[in-house]
């Protein structure tokens, strides 16, 4: 096929494993500016689901700390402050994108990959399977 | 500190932007094989902090398509199946990675860029400022 | 030898459909977004529909929405274009292109190119 000629201020593609592998400029653009002053950084434990924020850590993928929230219960607070079994704390996932270094311990090398995280926890109604 | 001796199989680290440009291989690993077979999907119906998913679409975004939550209601949903606004929904935010082409005529050179998206809704207690 | 091959492009009449394909070989179509283009004689080639690596989500220009479909099917390596209710305006040859990742608007970001298929719509 045609191939048109490239740009020279571009990086280099001549690597032998292009197109599988990319240049990506870390110095990371932050979209968030405008973020909402009001943080989600207290819900965790005034959420009617509350929820613990355990630290996962790997030098070795890039952000290397993710923080993972567990459902503190597995029903929900009531307006008493007990744990009503008639509804349930579930975690709220999301796929994510990380960069995991490859070949290990190389310093400019990664591979893309794909995570599911638990970001927090929101109280449901259950499924009630009835037994005939 | 320490100097880690560098693996010899390691792409060429010389480019003059190094540390900030790295080389990627986009042949996604996925995590998420063993993932709870009790998905996430239906969570926003049934979370008493109910939320629409609205589709935030970029071409020229890696990946194009994120899915952000609105929470439906001010406040929650009671027993009754009522809004109380004694509680307040509100949106469990999470900083994600995605990759842009940069510079945008270059076919193999990406810079990360991180946004801030609402994944699900979880209902608070609300913080009441009493007025001396 | 990498290449991306166009085919299903003809002469038509005003109203009729065509069907183009596009085959990758050489490589994998994956992690790429594959585009369409046209060059109408004496035109600027246009970007006329790209389709994403990620999810599959279509993008067209004004002037071909609600009559073309863009779609792809990985497991053959190969990006099809859906022509409806074609116009004499639609005359053009017609590439595929294959860049990394995302759609873009800048032609020098698409990898690679196909030789590109007539299209003719005359009465």
């Known amino acids: 096929g045609i191939t048109i000629p490239r740009n020279p201020g571009c990086p280099n593609s001549e690597d032998k494993n292009f197109p599988r592998t990319v240049m990506v400029n870390l110095n990371i653009h932050n979209r968030n500016t405008n973020t909402n002053p009001k943080r989600s950084s207290d819900y965790y434990n005034r959420s009617t689901s509350p929820w613990n924020l355990h630290r996962n850590e790997d030098p070795e993928r890039y952000p290397s700390v993710i923080w993972e929230a567990k459902c503190r219960h597995l029903g929900c607070i009531n307006a008493d402050g007990n744990v009503d079994y008639h509804m349930n704390s579930v975690p709220i996932q999301q796929e994510i994108l990380v960069l995991r270094r490859e070949p290990p311990h190389c310093p400019n090398s990664f591979r893309l990959e794909k995570i599911l995280v638990s970001v927090g926890c929101t109280c449901v109604t259950p499924i009630v399977h009835h037994v005939a | 500190g320490i100097t880690i001796p560098r693996n010899p199989g390691c792409p060429n680290s010389e480019d003059k932007n190094f540390p900030r440009t790295v080389m990627v291989n986009l042949n996604i690993h996925n995590r998420n094989t063993n993932t709870n077979p009790k998905r996430s999907s239906d969570y926003y119906n049934r979370s008493t902090s109910p939320w629409n998913l609205h589709r935030n679409e970029d071409p020229e975004r890696y990946p194009s398509v994120i899915w952000e939550a609105k929470c439906r209601h001010l406040g929650c949903i009671n027993a009754d199946g009522n809004v109380d606004y004694h509680m307040n929904s509100v949106p469990i935010q999470q900083e994600i990675l995605v990759l842009r082409r940069e510079p945008p005529h270059c076919p193999n050179s990406f810079r990360l860029e991180k946004i801030l998206v609402s994944v699900g809704c979880t209902c608070v207690t609300p913080i009441v400022h009493h007025v001396a | 030898e990498v290449q991306l091959v166009e085919s299903g492009g003809g002469l038509v009449q005003p109203g009729e459909s065509l069907r183009l394909s596009c085959k990758a070989s050489?490589?994998?179509?994956?992690?790429?977004?594959l585009g369409w283009f046209r060059q109408a004689p004496g035109k600027e080639r246009e970007g006329i529909s790209c389709?994403?690596?990620?999810?599959?989500?279509?993008y067209y220009t004004d002037s071909v929405k609600g009559r073309f479909t863009i779609s792809r099917d990985n497991s053959k390596n190969t990006v099809y274009l859906q022509m409806n209710s074609l116009k004499t305006e639609d005359t053009a040859i017609y590439y595929c292109?294959?860049?990394?990742?995302?759609?873009?608007?800048?032609?020098?970001?698409?990898?690679?190119w196909g030789q590109g298929t007539q299209v003719t719509v005359s009465s």
């Open positions: 050489g490589f994998s179509l994956d992690y790429y977004a």
């Open positions: 292109a294959a860049a990394l990742l995302t759609c873009s608007s800048y032609y020098d970001a698409y990898t690679y």
């Open positions: 389709i994403t690596s990620s999810d599959a989500s279509a």
